[in-house]
Amino acid sequence: EKAMVDGSWLDLAKRSKLEAQPFAHLTINATDIPSGSHKVSLSSWYHDRGWAKISNMTFSNGKLIVNQDGFYYLYANICFRHHETSGDLATEYLQLMVYVTKTSIKIPSSHTLMKGGSTKYWSGNSEFHFYSINVGGFFKLRSGEEISIEVSNPSLLDPDQDATYFGAFKVRDID
């Protein structure tokens, strides 16, 4: 019986530790996509609707803020699309890019952690164009550090929650 009690306490401890593990999955807020044809910061994301969730991390001013030191897996998926019903592309040669950036407040600095993308030729003869970028990586992050997303050509972003999103989850503590 003692062993069973110990075991259940162990399960509870493990479960509460897992529940305390920080994670975030943020989806694009389609009503507030910025304009611009160059690199712009995406600051409007959902954290509590549809697929979007956050726990033991903070979303503020367009940035995902780390609350616990640790090693985190960061990921971002950005979809670009254009359909001729919305008009024509003013240029057919496009650079479609995403940048995942870490900003440190304590020592004011900014680093690009990941970038992805391609130059594309989207011919005006085609009715529909689509391009998807997925980046992911394992990073040591400290409490207070902020993660943000920048993209090129935001007017071409796919606004669906399954298309444009980013997130993070803690994998382990820093030894």
Epitope: G87, E92, L156
Partner: antibody
Framework: QVQLVQSGAEVRKPGASVKVSCKAS????????IHWVRQAPGQRLEWMGW????????KFSQKFQGRITVTRDTAASTAYMELRSLRSEDTAVYYC???????????????????WGQGTLVTVSS | EIVMTQSPSSLSASVGDRVTITCRAS??????LNWYQLKPGKAPRLLIY???SLQSGVPSRFSGSGSGAEFTLTISSLQPEDIATYYC?????FGQGTKVEIK
Amino acid sequence: QVQLVQSGAEVRKPGASVKVSCKASGYDFSNYAIHWVRQAPGQRLEWMGWINAGNGNTKFSQKFQGRITVTRDTAASTAYMELRSLRSEDTAVYYCARDSANMVRGIIIAYYFDYWGQGTLVTVSS
Amino acid sequence: EIVMTQSPSSLSASVGDRVTITCRASQSISRYLNWYQLKPGKAPRLLIYGASSLQSGVPSRFSGSGSGAEFTLTISSLQPEDIATYYCQHTRAFGQGTKVEIK
């Protein structure tokens, strides 16, 4: 205020060419596209083509491909539309119109024509 | 190629009447639909863009609605200065026009 002022009426013989100008003022000419639209007597409006005034890119209706040239002079904030090998069916009022989409804010030419020129009557008659 | 069809081709109404013009697209165009007013000898005027957004400076008696393939332009209270031909437009395609006259 935004204004598009077009050149005056023209009369041409069949087979000739005509060049219509459209002078823009009141906004940054390079940040917008200019479209050309015509209306023949008793007919609906007909889109002919556009020019991105910033980079000079153009797109034309299949109907006019090979007969139309659209250019721009950014220093003079003026767009030009030349139509060649004129026939009597080309008798129409030709309009220039500004696309509402600011190219600094995005790269989609939206086809919302927010300002128009007063029109230029081109008569093709032998 | 998308074809835009307007109805009626002409109408006659009294001052103060509510006037409705319909525009149909040959396939779904979401809300990418604009309305223009044309008066002889004058520059065309954008009234409504994006199916229902009123262009600045246009009187509030003009309104637009619809999405997909069916759209309407409504003049809630016809005024003498509204005598004109009205066109719907999606990108490169225009409707054939509706001529509005006063009874």
